[in-house]
C-alpha cells in the first residue's frame, strides 16, 4: 500500500493515575476526507490493537464508548490519550494512520512511543 510518514514521540511517562498522552502527526500526501487512527501495542513480536477511531477531516475523533483511548484532531495531528494503564502495560505503542477516502488508500506507521507506567505506591494506613 502507499506509504505515508507518521511521527510520534519516542518516550512518554504515564501519570500516577495511569494516563499517557502523546501526539501522532502524519504527512498527508493528498486531501483525505476520512482518516482512521489506530493505536497498536507491540510486545516481543506480537502486535495487538489497543484502540481505533475514524474521523472525517474537520470533525472530532470518535472512539468506541468502551475504549481506553480518547483523542482530538487538528489538521494532520492527532492528540491521543490512553487511560487505565498499569505497570504491566509498559511497552511500545505504535500510531497507525490510514487515509481511507478518497482513494488511493495510504497507510502510515509510526516508530512507536515507549510508554512507561509505574504503579503508585499504596498509601500507608493512617490513624485519625
Amino acid at each position: 500500500c502507499k506509504a505515508m510518514h507518521v511521527a510520534q514521540p519516542a518516550v512518554v511517562l504515564a501519570s500516577s493515575r495511569g494516563i499517557a498522552s502523546f501526539v501522532c502527526e502524519y504527512a498527508s500526501p493528498g486531501k483525505a476526507t476520512e482518516v482512521r487512527v489506530t493505536v497498536l501495542r507491540q510486545a516481543d513480536s506480537q502486535v495487538t490493537e489497543v484502540c481505533a477511531a475514524t474521523y472525517m477531516m474537520g470533525n472530532e475523533l470518535t472512539f468506541l464508548d468502551d475504549s481506553i483511548c480518547t483523542g482530538t484532531s487538528s489538521g494532520n495531528q492527532v492528540n491521543l490519550t490512553i487511560q487505565g494503564l498499569r505497570a504491566m502495560d509498559t511497552g511500545l505503542y505504535i500510531c497507525k494512520v490510514e487515509l481511507m477516502y478518497p482513494p488511493p488508500y495510504y497507510l502510515g506507521i509510526g516508530n512507536g512511543t515507549q510508554i512507561y507506567v509505574i504503579d503508585p505506591e499504596p498509601c500507608p494506613d493512617s490513624d485519625f
Epitope: C1, K2, A3, V47, E49, T54, K96, P104, L107, I109
Partner: antibody, heavy 123, light 108 residues
C-alpha cells in the same frame, strides 16, 4: 481447511439484477478483507470490489461503481455481491477471494479463492 | 491506476527447463507485488507475495525477484503441472487492485 463457495450465478437479461453469495469456512472470516474478482470468458482477471474485515469500508472498480454493492455478514461467515443494472460486459466468472488484514501493512493479497460462479448477461 | 504489463504473452518450454516471466509496472509499486498461477477451469492460486516470498505450500522451484517497476517470476526446473497461466498483481496503489494480462506457459 479453508473453503470459499460462491453461489447465485446464472443467466440474466441486461438491466436486471442478481445477488451472489460466498460462504466461507475454515478460517477466521472476521479477520479478513473480502474481495470479488471476475474473469470474462477467455480473458484475464479484473478486481471488482473489496469490503473491510469489519464491513466498515467498501471500495469498487470504476466499471461497477454505482451498480454493484458488496456486503458481508460476519455472523454467517458470508460475503455478498448485489449486482444491479447488469450489462453484457459484466458476463464473467465471479470469484470471491479473501485477503488477510495485517495490522502493520494493511490489506494483503488474495490468499484464498472460491471456485467461481458464472454470470451471463444476455437477452 | 497502475498498469502491469507481462511478457512474454506466451512462453513455450519443455519440462525440466527454466522459465523466466516478467512483469513491469507503469510506476513504482515498491515490493508490493504478487504472482498467481491459474490452471484451466480452476481459480487462481497465490504463489509469491511481496515480490519474493513464497506462499504456504509453494515448491522451492518457484522464486520471485524485483522491486520498483521490474519483477521476475522464475521456475527453476519446470514440472508438467507448472504449465498454466501466470498473473502478477499489485497492492501498492489501490483502488483499483490491478493484474497483469497474464503469461501463458505452454508445453513446447
Amino acid at each position: 481447511q479453508v473453503q470459499l463457495v460462491e453461489s447465485g450465478g446464472g443467466v440474466v437479461q441486461p438491466g436486471r439484477s442478481l445477488r451472489l453469495s460466498c460462504a466461507a469456512s475454515g478460517f477466521t472470516f472476521s479477520s479478513y478483507g473480502m474481495h470479488w474478482v471476475r474473469q470474462a470468458p477467455g480473458k484475464g482477471l479484473e478486481w471488482v470490489a473489496l469490503i473491510w474485515y469489519d464491513g466498515s469500508y467498501k471500495y469498487y472498480a470504476d466499471s461497477v461503481k454505482g451498480r454493484f454493492t458488496i456486503s458481508r455478514d460476519n455472523s454467517k461467515n458470508t460475503l455478498y455481491l448485489q449486482m444491479n443494472s447488469l450489462r453484457a460486459e459484466d458476463t464473467a466468472v465471479y470469484y470471491c477471494a479473501s485477503a488477510y488484514y495485517d495490522l502493520l501493512t494493511g490489506p494483503y493479497y488474495f490468499d484464498y479463492w472460491g471456485q467461481g460462479t458464472l454470470v451471463t448477461v444476455s437477452s | 491506476e497502475i498498469v502491469l504489463t507481462q511478457s512474454p504473452a506466451t512462453l513455450s518450454l519443455s519440462p525440466g527447463e527454466r522459465a523466466t516471466l516478467s512483469c513491469r509496472a507503469s510506476q513504482s509499486v515498491s515490493s508490493y507485488l504478487a504472482w498467481y498461477q491459474q490452471k484451466p477451469g480452476q481459480a487462481p492460486r497465490l504463489l509469491i507475495y511481496d515480490a519474493s516470498n513464497r506462499a504456504t505450500g509453494i515448491p522451492a522451484r518457484f522464486s520471485g525477484s524485483g522491486s520498483g517497476t521490474d519483477f521476475t517470476l522464475t521456475i527453476s526446473s519446470l514440472e508438467p503441472e507448472d504449465f498454466a497461466v501466470y498473473y502478477c498483481q499489485q497492492r501498492s496503489n489501490w483502488p483499483p487492485y490491478t493484474f497483469g494480462q497474464g503469461t501463458k506457459l505452454e508445453i513446447k
